[in-house]
Amino acid sequence: AVNGTSQFTCFYNSRANISCVWSQDGALQDTSCQVHAWPDRRRWNQTCELLPVSQASWACNLILGAPDSQKLTTVDIVTLRVLCREGVRWRVMAIQDFKPFENLRLMAPISLQVVHVETHRCNISWEISQASHYFERHLEFEARTLSPGHTWEEAPLLTLKQKQEWICLETLTPDTQYEFQVRVKPLQGEFTTWSPWSQPLAFRTKPAALGKDT
């Protein structure tokens, strides 16, 4: 038997993916477990194998269909169970009635690109990936810029309180290498959280013109 505190957390990417992490203190690393999903109003059910991601946590993804297909709605409830093999039987280790649109975590923004760069400013755009049309414009973004000699954790957060897939960074230093990241969050959902950060976009400001004050 497995004892200790257990945590079972799942997020819906708003389209066709439910990602789950189960952590259990004192669980054996070679325990054979799966997540089982049973929607209340769909004619399918699904499972995925939980694979270790650290000493005491396991993760898996339920792929509900094509990446951009809308597989669940705001009225769906999916019963999610962690089942672990004990001899010839399965033991339910954790269970939750999962409301997809209360537990959202979108995919990281993609296609970051520099639209225009000058000596002191840079205009950057991006796209959101696999986000439900249900949100319409009800999304917010956070962005951060990595300056030379600093860490990402030290970078101040810039908040965009609307669906704005671009930003104009100001007061930059000429001829300097920067990196930029952005993440997205729907306004909907009690347990909704930020997406992962996007892949960093590296850019360099233009050098100051010779003979001019900067």
Epitope: Q46, T47, C48, G65
Partner: nanobody, 123 residues
């Protein structure tokens, strides 16, 4: 891309057993769930069972639970369906199918299919 080829179908009598085999080739099957479905003439494709890639976790339709057994031979890259106590209602074309990362009971979730093997159970 995964290629699937079923074999083992044929004509049997009521009460007989039959073992179907699905040979999988192509890329690594480390994350691939394999399922068996069947389709009788004029009917929808029905889910029978699926098996997971690493731990061989299985899931069965209630209609075949206890009578059909799905198993995986990793070395041979095959997934077998052992069918016992066959009845005329089991007559159908049997298909194996594959999908990545999670198993599903819905046929439309699968993107790779074999060509099927006919099973006929006579009374």
């Amino acid at each position: 891309q995964v290629q699937l080829v079923e074999s083992g179908g044929g004509l049997v009598q009521t009460g007989d057993s039959l073992r179907l085999s699905c040979a999988a080739s192509g890329r690594s099957l480390d994350t691939t769930y394999i399922a068996w479905f069947r389709q009788a003439p004029g009917k929808e494709r029905d889910f029978l069972a699926y098996i997971s890639p690493r731990f061989s976790h299985t899931w069965y339709a209630d209609s075949v639970k206890g009578r059909f057994t799905i198993s995986r031979n990793i070395a041979k890259r095959t997934v077998d369906l052992e069918m016992n106590s066959l009845e005329p209602e089991d007559t159908a074309v049997y298909y194996c199918a594959a999908r990545e990362h999670s198993g599903s009971t819905a046929w439309e979730h699968y993107d790779h299919w074999g060509q099927g093997t006919q099973v006929t159970v006579s009374s």
